[in-house]
């Protein structure tokens, strides 16, 4: 808290300019009018104010706008945004994508801070849904943004927004998140032809059910092993050896290197050894010939 002192003669700021960097904290407090600061916020970022000086400027704005800053000020906060607390940001009403971009630019190249997370939350809630332009912007600044959302939050993403998603945006998504995103992607890309569709849907397949994987196996897609390893185990288990062979195409040979890892390991345990042998890969652990396989889950469902 800066003490209230009179502004020295001749030091009253008539505009926000670079001469203010030579002002001590108490001089800034005494000589800079808050209303002037608010109208000339766009100049603040052009001047190398220190941490302490920015504290004083923030204090002046807080006094002028105790209920929260107007968007005209927020858009030009620049590095002053780094001084805001999540509590400050919760008072804001940010509706313009330009404002969001301007503030994300300040934090560019750095991890998402609590301030940024709060800002994004306020913005998205204000819009009611995560539209394509917003998603475009957020994933451009934070590729992992989508995977930081809960499945409930992801449910507000309209299928049209899925076009903005790049494969790297899904790198850290878990199966629960992909379960929500996959049906949206399937809907978004439904009018594409086979090979183009597969290119687009590939990074979402961690949420695909068995029937969709069976359908893909009929389309000569040649899925790579990295994608296969990210599939839901429960979706892979019912696939036959022939279906997996068709799904992977020339990549089927990669199963050998992954035979101890899920979902390959669990899938092998469900296949007849005879069928596995037809692949000629030396996969071991299948059901020995002559054994009867009882599907207990089916039995429970019938009883």
């Amino acid at each position: 808290e800066v003490e209230k002192t009179a502004c020295p003669s001749g030091k009253k700021a008539r505009e926000i300019d670079e001469s203010l960097i030579f002002y001590k904290k108490w001089e800034l407090e005494a000589c800079v009018d808050a209303a002037l600061l608010a109208t000339q916020m766009d100049r603040v970022n052009a001047i190398p104010f220190t941490y302490e000086q920015l504290d004083v400027l923030k204090h002046k704005l807080d006094e002028l706008y105790p209920q929260g800053y107007p968007e005209s000020v927020i858009q030009h906060l620049g590095y002053l945004f780094l001084k805001m607390s999540p509590e400050d940001i919760r008072k804001w009403n940010v509706t313009s994508l330009e404002t969001l971009k301007a503030l994300l630019e300040v934090n560019k190249g750095h991890e998402m801070s609590p301030q940024v997370a709060t800002l994004i939350d306020r913005f998205v809630k204000g819009r009611g849904q995560l539209d394509k332009d917003t998603l475009d912007t957020l994933t451009a600044f934070y590729p992992g943004y989508l995977c930081s959302l809960s499945p409930e939050e992801l449910s507000s993403v309209p299928p049209s927004s899925i076009w903005a998603v790049r494969p790297q945006d899904l790198d850290t998504c878990d199966p629960r998140q992909l379960d929500v995103l996959y049906p949206k992607a399937r809907l978004a890309f439904q009018n594409m032809n086979g090979s183009e569709y597969f290119v687009k849907i590939q990074s979402f397949l961690g949420g695909a059910p068995t029937e969709d994987l069976k359908a893909l196996s009929q389309q000569n897609v040649s899925m790579d092993l990295a994608t296969f390893m990210k599939l839901r185990t429960d979706a892979v288990l019912p696939l036959t050896v022939a279906e997996v062979q068709k799904l992977l195409g020339p990549h089927v040979e990669g199963l050998k290197a992954e035979e101890r890892h899920r979902p390959v390991r669990d899938w092998i345990l469900r296949q007849r050894q005879d069928d596995l042998d037809t692949l000629g890969l030396g996969l071991q652990g299948g059901i020995p010939n002559g054994y009867l396989v009882l599907d207990l889950s089916m039995q429970e469902a019938l009883s």
Epitope: N45, A46, I47, P48, Y51, L54, Y79, V106, N107
Partner: nanobody, 114 residues
Framework: VQLVESGGGLVQPGGSLRLSCAAS????????VAWYRQAPGEQREPVAA???????IYADSVKGRFTISRDNAKNTVYLQMNSLKPEDTAVYYC??????????WGQGTSVTVS
Amino acid sequence: VQLVESGGGLVQPGGSLRLSCAASGSMFSINAVAWYRQAPGEQREPVAAMTSGGSTIYADSVKGRFTISRDNAKNTVYLQMNSLKPEDTAVYYCNGGWSLALDYWGQGTSVTVS
């Protein structure tokens, strides 16, 4: 953001030095930057600054003797110091943008005029 200041040393009164400050990323090409100094037992104070638009300003004590400049391609800021005086003895730091706003500083470079 890493800031690395260099170019300091021991110099006689009336001599010259050119300080350099390199930053990681494209920090200096887009931001306002400044040189600061801290004499023993004193507060850190601004010496020279350049706005993001390229205009410069100097502390009264160094006007006409010091010149701040930058090379965006090298992401480096310079401080040319001429007609040095004993009272210019201090550790010199540069800063700007994100790191300045969050109070992150480099190690500085020491200038002794004697």
